[in-house]
Every structure is written in C-alpha cells, then in structure tokens.
C-alpha cells in the first residue's frame, strides 16, 4: 500500500488581477480517512481558503464536483483575484479525529504571484 | 464484481470473545476504508466500526471491548471482540466504503452478514 | 453525535401507488445523506447517496431530496420488490455514523 502524495504541479502561478486563479491539487490515495483543505501560508496564523465541510468561501469552487464518487483532485478555482491573493497555497490532507482531525500530510505549496498585466 | 464474504459468528456466553472476518474481493481493498455494521434482531442498523490504513473508529458502545483490523495482503477485514455483552447480539455486516464531497462515506457493497449471539 | 429521525415507521401502500418518506436530521448535514434497501433477510442495499444520486443499476422510480436536515425519499409506482425497510445515514458528522431508525413499506 502506497503511503499518500499531496501533488502540487505547480511550483509558481502567475495570475492577473480580477482573472480566476485554477490552483492544483491531487492526493495518490484515498487514505486515511479525512477531508483536504486549502489554506494560505503556514504556521498558526495561515489562513483557511477553502473547507468543504464549513465555512463560506464566496469566491471559491471546486474543479471537481463535490458528488464525485473517490476523488482525489482536490483542485480549487479563486475568482477575482486581487493584490491581496498573493502568497503561497497549501492544500492540506487532514486524518479524521474525534472530535479534532489532526493534520497528516501537506503538498509542496503553489505560490501565487502577479503577473504582468496583458497589454 | 465486490464481494463481501463474512465468517466467525456464533454463539458465545458473556464475557467470551469472537473474531469475525470478512473476506473482500473484486476491488482493490487496501484502497478503500472499511466497515462494521451490526443489527440486533428486530432492530435497525448500528455503526460499529470503520478502519482506513493505520486510522481505526469506534462506537462508544464497543470501544475498548472491539478491535478493528485488516491485512491487505489477505483482503481481509477483521473485528476481534471481546468481554461481549447480551446487547451484542446481532447480524455483523462487513461494508465498503466510498466517499464523496471531499470527506464523509457511505457504505455501497454490503455483505450477506453473520450472525453473533452472545447467551449464556 | 447526529441523531436521524425517520417517519412514519411504517407505511402501508398498495402496488403501484406513490410512497413518500422523510428523514429528519437533528442538525445540519448538508447534502451527506445516503439511503438503503433492506429486504426481508438480506442485507442493506445503498440506493441513493450525496441526497439525490442515485446509485448505479438503481430504477429510476427512487428518487431523493432535500438539503440540511430535511430529507425526502420518494418511490414511483410501487413493485413488489419495493416492500422493505429503508434506512437513512448521514456522513456528514462522524464517528459516530448514524442512522435512522428506518421506514417499514408494507403492502396495503
């Protein structure tokens, strides 16, 4: 049994202001048990991106649909990207706890920088 | 085609033990957590226990008395359960797993199940 | 630990005829509830999972509904093969699973 892989392909996404930013994430397992999340930065003062399970995140949706049977490409899509987006993106395979899921497995993160504005 | 193949029920008095097994096939089980189900006679369906890979899962109604495992190498799920109590008894149903909306499962193979009965 | 209230515990259809029944979530659960099929001396059958996907190989006469902690199972047309114990389980919030205490449909 392979132990899980949290891919993420991109190293650097250059995104414009007011596009949607596509940020990639894949998982090589199933297991363990327990959602992914997205969040910004590390550490205690990172900030929560996307939870399927709680939360309202206005400008975020899935690449994947949420009814999909076994996913495992936990991809989001920000809209309306602003200056204040950029940073870099974790997503974050957690293992089901009881009651508190306990973080098990980070991807490399995606860093998400202005590019130059298309003339 | 899944299938779930439970063995190990009987009868057994009142703080004895039993290990049932469920043999899987037709998928590929390590990559799927999996679960007991048990239903008293006349009653309903009560979740007992889920295992993914190293990660186990209990009711509070068996913690400390149940023990889940798998051996991925055999296919093989396992409920080893001891002190059993009269309120044990019931049909134990081994199930696979599937998950949807990024965390949370639902049980889409069930077995034909086997039937525990804890008296003295 | 999410309690499921289903109702009525028994409903008594005649062949053919619509049956309706809920299931009432004592908190939200979103979308993550499936429903299941037990026959007379089988084991649970999963038909519908997410509230209203139907599983695989599932006629088209079972249909879900409802979102947070309202949900509605529905059969078209009973057949004879439709007379059994349905259960609901959420999946939103565990452990522990839970499910409902189940809906008896009989023949009227």
């Known amino acids: 049994e392979e132990e899980l892989q949290m891919i993420q392909p991109e190293k650097l996404l250059l995104v414009t202001v007011g596009k949607t930013a596509t940020l990639h994430c894949t998982v090589t397992s199933l297991l363990p048990v327990g959602p992914v999340l997205w969040f910004r930065g590390v550490g205690p003062g990172r900030e929560l991106i996307y939870n399927q399970k709680e939360g309202h995140f206005p400008r975020v949706t899935t690449v994947s649909d949420l009814t999909k049977r076994n996913n495992m490409d936990f991809s989001i899509r920000i809209s309306s990207i602003t200056p204040a987006d950029v940073g870099t993106y974790y997503c974050v395979k957690f293992r089901k706890g009881s009651p508190e899921n306990v973080e098990f497995k980070s991807g490399p993160g995606t860093e998400m920088a202005l590019g130059a504005k298309p003339s | 085609e899944v299938q779930l193949l439970e063995s190990g029920g009987g009868v057994v008095q009142p703080g004895g033990s039993l290990r049932l097994s469920c043999a899987a096939s037709g998928f590929s089980f390590s990559n799927f957590a999996m679960t007991w189900v048990r239903q008293a006679p006349g009653e309903g369906l009560e979740w007992v226990s889920t295992i993914g890979s190293g990660d186990t899962y209990y009711a509070d109604s068996v913690k400390g008395r149940f023990t889940i495992s798998r051996d991925n190498s055999k296919n093989t799920l396992y409920l080893q359960m001891n002190s059993l109590r009269a309120e044990d008894t019931a049909v134990y149903y081994c199930?696979?797993?599937?998950?949807?909306?990024?965390?949370?499962?639902?049980?889409?193979?069930w077995g034909l199940g086997t039937l525990v009965t804890v008296s003295s | 630990e999410i309690v499921l209230t289903q109702s009525p515990a028994t409903l008594s259809v005649s062949p053919g005829e619509r049956a309706t029944f809920s299931c009432r979530a004592s908190q939200n659960v979103k979308n993550d509830l499936a429903w299941y099929q037990q026959r007379p001396g089988q084991a649970p059958r999963l038909l519908i999972y997410?509230?209203?996907i139907r599983e695989t190989g599932i006629p088209e006469r079972f249909s879900g509904s409802g979102s947070g902690t309202e949900f509605t199972l529905t059969i078209t047309s009973l057949q004879s093969e439709d007379f059994a114990v349905y259960y609901c389980q959420q999946y939103y919030d565990w452990p522990p699973f839970t499910f409902g205490g189940g809906t008896k449909v009989e023949i009227k």
């Open positions: 199930a696979k797993d599937s998950t949807v909306s990024w965390s949370g499962d639902f049980f889409d193979y």
């Open positions: 997410a509230a209203r």
